[in-house]
Amino acid sequence: FERTRSLQDPCSNCPAGTFCDNNRNQICSPCPPNSFSSAGGQRTCDICRQCKGVFRTRKECSSTSNAECDCTPGFHCLGAGCSMCEQDCKQGQELTKKGCKDCCFGTFNDQKRGICRPWTNCSLDGKSVLVNGTKERDVVCGPSPADLSPGASSVTPPAPAREPGHSPQ
């Protein structure tokens, strides 16, 4: 019965970008402005997403596809389909309830989102510190002495601790 009904259902002939208008003898009508249908056979068109405020339009709505939003400069997307915008911070900072705060000594963040993370502990891999970390950059671990071969970098001992944010040159 279902198969027979679908074969006889005039709405199944309505393509994406239209809807099956019950008020007009199930004629396929184009989606009204600011609405879309992404699949055929739909009895209604969906309202287009509107990118307002901190959201900006990345892709305009068409009769067959929804609008896509991203975030205005200074913010980045979070969640599926960019459902939220979160404030950017500078490299070397993390976002807290009180705004962007510098990473504590011994931690870093090399991105404009996310949290400050502890520097890599080179000794866990039996390696030594090749370059010291900063609040913007992780420590770089060097090969253990046994790994060194001709042409490879020699391992430098850890330099005295620097204030975070001062890159070793």
Partner: antibody, heavy 127, light 110 residues
């Protein structure tokens, strides 16, 4: 020895789709960031996308954002790039690249560069 | 147009020392590690320098990297014919949330 073997390239019409694969061997695939880098004929290198192994985070170049999707299957040691809505300017050799710095011990791979590369697969976009 | 600027070409004679520059900004080179790649004709790129100035195992000490502020340099001493290749600098750019490559420098050994 690190080995990366790309496949899936070919000729596609503008607006079409392709899925590239990169089979990895010779290292612990699940411990490393992986990137796709492309090079248009006679042009320079352009980074396309990176995927992290620990949190699955992904990042994309602005030129491909919303059209390309990077993914990985650690159980199959394989990296993927799904390319939709292809444009003429996407035509290039696509390289799969392994980053240095094994995770989770290493927190960030950016210092270590891309220390392993495949030989590339050619994507041609033409009508 | 790349956010990292490299000279399109450089040249030298065998035995000479050549330097290739790479200029960026505080959002990339200024606060992040620079890497350098060599691409010989018809081959995939190869990592030459990581973390601004360190050589992976197997890279000759003729190659050296340095960084100052928002600029980086690759120096090749004792130039050889087999060094003829394209050289690229690269780094992470936090404002773009992605990696960036320089446009490449074609090195010719005369």
């Amino acid at each position: 020895e690190v080995q990366l073997l790309e496949s899936g390239g070919g000729l596609v019409q503008p607006g079409g789709s392709l899925r590239l694969s990169c089979a990895a061997s010779g290292f612990t695939f699940s411990g490393y960031d992986m990137s796709w880098v492309r090079q248009a004929p006679g042009k320079g290198l352009e980074w396309v996308s990176v995927i992290y192994p620990d949190d699955g985070n992904t990042y994309y170049a602005d030129s491909v954002k919303g059209r390309f999707t990077i993914s990985r299957d650690n159980s199959k040691n394989t990296l993927y790039l799904q390319m939709n809505s292809l444009r003429a300017e996407d035509a290039a050799v696509y390289y799969c690249a392994k980053h240095g710095g094994q995770k989770p011990t290493t927190k960030s791979s950016s210092a270590y560069g891309m220390d392993g590369w495949g030989q590339g697969t050619l994507v041609t976009v033409s009508s | 147009q790349s956010v990292l600027t490299q000279p399109p070409s450089a040249s030298g004679t065998p035995g000479q020392r050549v330097t290739i520059s790479c200029s960026g900004s505080s959002s990339n080179i200024g606060n992040n590690y620079v890497t350098w790649y060599q691409q010989l004709p018809g081959t995939a790129p190869k990592l030459l320098i990581y973390a601004d100035s360190h050589r992976p195992s197997g890279v000759p000490d003729r190659f050296s990297g340095s960084k100052s502020g928002t600029s980086a340099s690759l120096a090749i001493s004792g130039l050889r014919s087999e060094d003829e290749a394209d050289y690229y600098c690269a780094t992470w750019d936090y404002s773009l949330s992605g990696y960036v490559f320089g446009c490449g420098t074609k090195l010719t050994v005369l």
